[in-house]
């Protein structure tokens, strides 16, 4: 068992068919020493009386507030969480495997640029008695800090039958240099709580690995004389780390029809502009990636070709 | 505004050519190196991560950009560091910060140099011959550093006596690999930004 | 199976012209770009211009401009090329050559030898 | 017009060894760089697109690497099979051109 927060304890588990459990033992937070009672939740029925409390810890019904009370008045409260290992393994129930880049990804996260600035996000089922909290470091034997914000629902989806639900979080690096050379990956720890389960979820990278650099901005069109092709230009997105000739991008030119299947006219270029042959109802799309670390590519932005 | 662009020309700024050629020849090494030694430990987040260039070289201090230097956490190692305008030690002065800027990669590249020579003598020696040093990487680097034009001492190829460990030696060569990619994207950084000013 | 079938060799005075044909088949016709590249023998691969079937668009090499021109007739699934003025140096193996991607070629043409002779 | 430089012209290979063949551009190409193997009296066939991308049913021994104005096809064990002439096509901008060939032969 260990606290969580104040008053908040988490019970770990073996979770398998008659397990033993853990045996816990309460202890009232008061000075008083006789004529406590225990009770749990919203339950009147005592369960013990003394200071402090012995309990067999074997499922959930275990589980929730516990309350030490002397005459009618509460003295403290103690919140049981459980936190399953299955064939040695802690439970996953309460977020989704979003299977991308690897199996077992609960958290993602992406960086706009180099300021040490980042957004992590995941994705539940569940839609009530939810809370999460996160932590986050530069190393974990020296950890050096990351500030987070509070996680919140950032997106609803409905997907089949069910409604999934996106909640992100936005940390900062205290001290980031945009040039440094990273050595010690970030740290990222989300605990989980779904009623009286507990679990907790972490995330390791580098800021470099995840960058994502925003789509292009100002995309415009400028037909050349007597041809088919046409001048598109664009700038670098806002976000993106300066001195850009420092932190230079690199660019992919689309031009496609609605459909993906259709035919296409690509070209690469490190410059802001490019040549490209325009079709009848297509779209030219730009995107960005890091010119020297490749990373992901930016999202699409794109104006129509006529 | 908008920046030049970092077109190759070699007599503007051969440097960035070559540093271009760098980041090439160090990737495809460390992806031919991540492919072969697939039950190897090899890959970002399998190895430790260690620069064999710390506390000897300063090349992010050096070499940061001008606007940088009002970031108080890129100066934490250094008083004042920045680079100015100027070629790759050809023709014109330079400034004496880029001078720094410049030595310090010419020292990195002489670091790695050896440390990949001595381990491609162990490599050598292993009977399965599972992985060699890229020749075209070694030759990249040695151009830039002719590039960058530096006279300094000659560091001697460390030779052992002791028989090669050679798991440990092929662990040591994604280490490198790794922290090398990494500088010599700062690397390309830096000659990208010199060309642009 | 995506396969092009080109017409066969010719022979041809200097002075007159030469069309190539080259019939698509597995795919549809208008889903690709269809280019012209020609290889004098003995010699490197040239490059002479694209036709969008869907819509007509061309668009030539300035070498041959004038000179060649690409015509698409979608109900067939056949591409034609034309060079007019023919002289020596156009004796060349000519290839068509398709993509669902404008500026390179997935899917060659088995070529079509033109041999201009006086 | 963009001009492709290949070399060498000629390579003689050994069967097993390795083989790189470069390709040079006269201006920046980005990753505009395709690779295309033609065997005598036969139409050129694509081996790799955007300087470094495979194609499905060509061996995995064919490779590309570069960027820029400098790129190699990489050939890592060379099979009787692949004795062959092999060039380099730049799609930066119009008109396209081509390298003026390497033919790989045997030592």
């Known amino acids: 068992i260990w606290e969580l927060k104040k008053d908040v304890y988490v019970v770990e588990l073996d979770w398998y068919p008659d397990a033993p459990g853990e045996m816990v033992v309460l202890t009232c937070d008061t000075p008083e020493e006789d004529g406590i009672t225990w009770t749990l939740d919203q339950s009147s029925e005592v369960l013990g009386s003394g200071k402090t409390l012995t309990i067999q810890v074997k499922e959930f019904g275990d589980a929730g507030q516990y309350t030490c009370h002397k005459g009618g008045e509460v003295l403290s409260h103690s919140l049981l969480l459980l936190h399953k290992k299955e064939d040695g393994i802690w439970s996953t129930d309460i977020l989704k495997d979003q299977k991308e880049p690897k199996n077992k990804t609960f958290l993602r996260c992406e960086a706009k640029n180099y300021s040490g600035r980042f957004t992590c996000w995941w994705l539940t089922t569940i839609s009530t008695d939810l809370t999460f909290s996160v932590k986050s470091s530069r190393g974990s034997s020296d950890p050096q800090g990351v500030t987070c914000g509070a996680a919140t629902l950032s997106a609803e989806r409905v997907r089949g039958d069910n409604k999934e639900y996106e909640y992100s979080v936005e940390c900062q690096e205290d001290s980031a240099c945009p040039a440094a050379e990273e050595s010690l990956p970030i740290e990222v720890m989300v605990d989980a709580v779904h009623k009286l389960k507990y679990e907790n979820y972490t995330s390791s990278f580098f800021i470099r690995d995840i960058i994502k650099p925003d789509p292009p901005k100002n995309l415009q069109l400028k037909p050349l004389k007597n041809s088919r092709q046409v001048e598109v230009s664009w700038e670098y997105p806002d976000t993106w780390s300066t001195p850009h000739s420092y932190f230079s991008l690199t660019f992919c030119v689309q031009v496609q029809g609605k459909s993906k299947r259709e035919k296409k006219d690509r070209v690469f270029t490190d410059k802001t502009s490019a040549t490209v042959i325009c079709r009848k109802n297509a779209s030219i799309s730009v995107r960005a990636q890091d010119r020297y670390y490749s990373s992901s590519w930016s999202e699409w932005a794109s104006v129509p070709c006529s | 505004r908008n920046l030049p662009v970092a077109t190759p020309d070699p007599g503007m700024f051969p440097c960035l050519h070559h540093s271009q050629n760098l980041l090439r020849a160090v990737s495809n090494m460390l992806q031919k190196a991540r492919q072969t030694l697939e039950f190897y430990p090899c890959t970002s987040e399998e190895i430790d991560h260690e620069d064999i260039t710390k506390d000897k070289t300063s090349t992010v201090e050096a070499c940061l950009p001008l606007e940088l230097t009002k970031n108080e956490s890129c100066l934490n190692s250094r008083e004042t560091s920045f680079i100015t305008n100027g070629s790759c030690l050809a023709s014109r002065k330079t400034s004496f910060m880029m001078a720094l800027c410049l030595s310090s990669i010419y020292e990195d590249l002489k670091m790695y140099q050896v440390e990949f020579k001595t381990m491609n003598a162990k490599l050598l020696m292993d009977p399965k011959r599972q992985i060699f040093l890229d020749q075209n990487m070694l030759a990249v680097i040695d151009e830039l550093m002719q590039a960058l034009n530096f006279n300094s001492e000659t560091v001697p190829q460390k030779s052992s006596l002791e028989e090669p460990d050679f798991y440990k030696t092929k662990i040591k060569l994604c280490i490198l690999l790794h922290a090398f990619r990494i500088r010599a994207v700062t690397i390309d950084r830096v000659m990208s930004y010199l060309n642009a000013s | 199976q995506v396969q092009l079938v080109q017409s066969g060799a010719e022979v041809k005075k200097p002075g007159s012209s030469v069309k190539v044909s080259c019939k698509a088949s597995g795919g549809t016709f208008s889903d690709y770009y269809l280019h012209w590249v020609r290889q004098a023998p003995g010699q490197g691969l040239e490059w002479m211009g694209w036709i969008d079937p869907e819509n007509g668009d061309t668009e030539y090499a300035p070498k041959f401009q004038g000179r060649v021109t690409i015509t698409a007739d979608e109900s067939t699934s056949t591409a034609y090329m034309e060079l007019s003025s023919l002289r020596s140096e156009d004796t060349a193996v000519y290839y068509c050559?398709?993509?669902?991607?404008?500026?390179?070629?997935?899917?060659w043409g088995q070529g079509t030898l033109v041999t201009v002779s006086s | 017009d963009i001009v492709m430089t290949q070399s060498p012209l000629s390579l003689p290979v050994t069967p097993g060894e390795p083989a790189s063949i470069s390709c040079r551009a006269s201006q920046s190409i980005s990753i505009n760089l395709h690779w295309y193997q033609q065997k005598p009296g036969q139409q050129p066939r694509l081996l790799i697109y955007?300087?470094?991308q495979s194609i499905s049913g060509v061996p995995s021994r064919f490779s590309g690497s570069g960027s820029g104005t400098d790129f190699t096809l990489t050939i890592s064990s060379l099979q009787p099979e692949d004795f062959a002439t092999y060039y380099c096509q730049q799609s930066n901008s119009f008109p396209l051109t081509f390298g003026q060939g390497t033919k790989v032969e045997i030592k």
């Open positions: 955007f300087a470094s």
């Open positions: 050559a398709r993509n669902k991607e404008l500026r390179y070629f997935d899917v």
